[in-house]
């Protein structure tokens, strides 16, 4: 970890980090690292790991250092921790490190695992989870279902998975998801394998999830980052055609913002 | 590519006050602070002061207090210094500096004040 | 405020020479140091900053080291055009302070 000189936690408290837009984001996007102390300081340093000097630093005359980082680029992400000095603590003094923050800059969030539970084969009455399993927090989940164009199920998660709820005499089927940020500007996980779900007496089968005809590709998420569960038009698949908007059966349910969570 | 124009040069008399510009291109002016710098004929250089143009703090060597004050025009990337009460003592040239996180300094070109009745 | 003491003042050396020029600290500037170059009538130049990072488009020949109080500057092999002040900055402390500045001419 960083070992930059520091005072006891009480004397120099540490500041807080922050990432603008996200700490998640795609080449190319402009972000800014927010560093706030608790005292005005005179200059703030973000520091990589293991180093005893900052990286990057600025002076400032205020509580507040923000740092541009213009068109990001995959090397600028990692992980960093802001500091801060004040004149009067004495030569390379700092304060007690800030919590670490992880800058994902990236085309692409790796692809979600898709399995069900406790299992793929459903009994009579039973329900089945299916749990969609990414490797990032606080990402939006999204499940759909074979020859349903619009997204089946929608969950935003603090955990690095989602649970989706099958009803049992609606579960069978064959089943893909994938996450994306929550918010602007998004970043999409590549889909997962597809999972089919199959009643007892019927041996599940799995393949990947270019091969399930008739379930659409992820496109971006909703335009409004205060949508929960986007409607079908917000999901344009990049390289394929949109399916037209299926009637409204419990087998094409097309959830609109506000999100509901209708079992299948 | 990086450019911080400076105003030409200015001739004034005792006791008035002069106005430098420093219009900044290249890259985003309100991302980087902007630092003044004094050098008298034929001697080393002093730090007058920087402002951040985001939010318009300053901060002063003691030594320039009264003496300098920084403003900015984000609409037009451009930072300015004004002195004030001049005397022979402030003909000197000045140079704008933006720092970038680095540590790195970028100069302008200078503006050469005389002071002189 | 932090004392730069810069030495030599001022010293003639010949093309091709390895020169150095260095930078003492009244305490300690923990590397934030550049080294600056200024012709006649121009603006300064920044050579190295952090000590020893070279500027993007400076010649290979400049080099910068030292930690803690003491920096130093080199010239590997003195080309004609290096002739000029060179001047080291602090700006680990506020207000940020320079050396006295070295007097390089060509022998």
């Known amino acids: 970890d960083i070992t930059p000189s520091v005072p006891p936690a009480s004397y120099h408290p540490k500041p807080w980090l922050g990432a603008q837009p996200a700490t998640v984001v795609t080449p190319g996007v402009n972000v800014t690292l927010r560093c706030r102390a608790p005292q005005p300081a005179w200059r703030f340093g973000l520091f990589k790991p293991g180093e005893i000097a900052p990286l990057l630093f600025r002076d400032v005359s205020s509580e507040l250092a923000e740092f541009f980082l213009e068109e990001v680029t995959p090397a600028q992400g990692g992980i960093y921790r802001c500091c801060y000095r004040r004149p009067d603590w004495g030569p390379g003094v700092w304060s007690q490190p800030s919590d670490v923050l992880e800058l994902l800059v990236t085309e692409e969030l790796p692809r979600p695992s898709l399995v069900a539970l406790p299992g793929p084969v459903v009994g009579p009455g039973a329900n089945v989870s299916l749990r969609c399993a990414g490797r990032l927090r606080n990402m939006s989940f999204v499940l759909y279902r074979e020859g349903v164009a619009a997204p089946l199920q929608y969950r935003h998660s603090a955990q690095p998975w989602a649970d989706f709820t099958l009803l049992g005499a609606r579960a069978p089927g064959t089943y893909s998801c994938y996450y994306h940020t929550p918010s602007a500007p998004y970043v999409l996980s590549q889909r997962s394998e597809v999972l089919v779900i199959s009643w007892e007496g019927e041996g599940p089968e799995a393949r990947p999830a270019s091969s399930a005809p008739g379930m659409q590709a992820p496109g971006p998420p909703p335009s409004d980052p205060g949508a929960q569960a986007p409607s079908l038009s917000s999901f344009r698949p990049r390289g394929l055609v949109l399916q037209p908007l299926l009637p409204q059966t419990q087998d094409s349910w097309d959830p609109a913002p506000p999100p509901s969570d209708p079992g299948v | 590519e990086i450019q911080l124009q400076q105003s030409g040069p200015e001739l004034v008399k005792p006791g008035a006050s002069v106005k430098v510009s420093c219009k900044a291109s290249?890259?985003?002016?309100?991302?980087?602070?902007m630092y003044w710098v004094k050098q008298s004929h034929g001697k080393s250089l002093e730090w007058i002061g920087y402002?951040?143009?985001?939010?318009?703090?300053?901060r002063y060597n003691q030594k320039f207090k009264g003496k300098a004050t920084l403003t900015v025009d984000k609409s037009s990337s451009t930072a300015y210094m004004h002195l004030n009460s001049l005397t022979s003592e402030d003909s000197a040239v000045y140079y704008c500096?933006?720092?970038?996180?680095?540590?790195?300094?970028?100069w302008g070109q200078g503006t050469t004040l005389t002071v002189s009745s | 405020d932090i004392k730069m003491t810069q030495s030599p003042s001022s010293m003639y050396a010949s093309l091709g020479e390895r020169v150095t020029i260095t930078c003492k600290a009244s305490?300690?500037?923990?590397?934030?140091l550049s080294w600056l170059q200024q012709k006649p009538g121009k603006s300064p130049k920044t050579l190295i900053y952090?000590?020893?990072r070279l500027v993007d488009g400076v010649p290979s020949r400049f080099s910068g080291s030292g930690s803690g109080q003491d920096y130093s500057l080199t010239i590997s092999s003195l080309e004609y055009e290096d002739m000029g002040i060179y001047y080291c900055?602090?700006?680990?402390?506020?207000?940020?302070?320079f050396g006295g500045g070295t007097k390089l001419e060509i022998k």
């Open positions: 500096a933006r720092l970038d996180y680095y540590g790195n300094f970028y």
């Open positions: 290249g890259y985003v002016f309100t991302s980087y602070n």
């Open positions: 402002i951040d143009p985001y939010n318009g703090g300053t």
């Open positions: 305490q300690d500037i923990n590397s934030f």
């Open positions: 952090r000590a020893n």
């Open positions: 900055l602090q700006y680990d402390d506020f207000p940020y302070t």
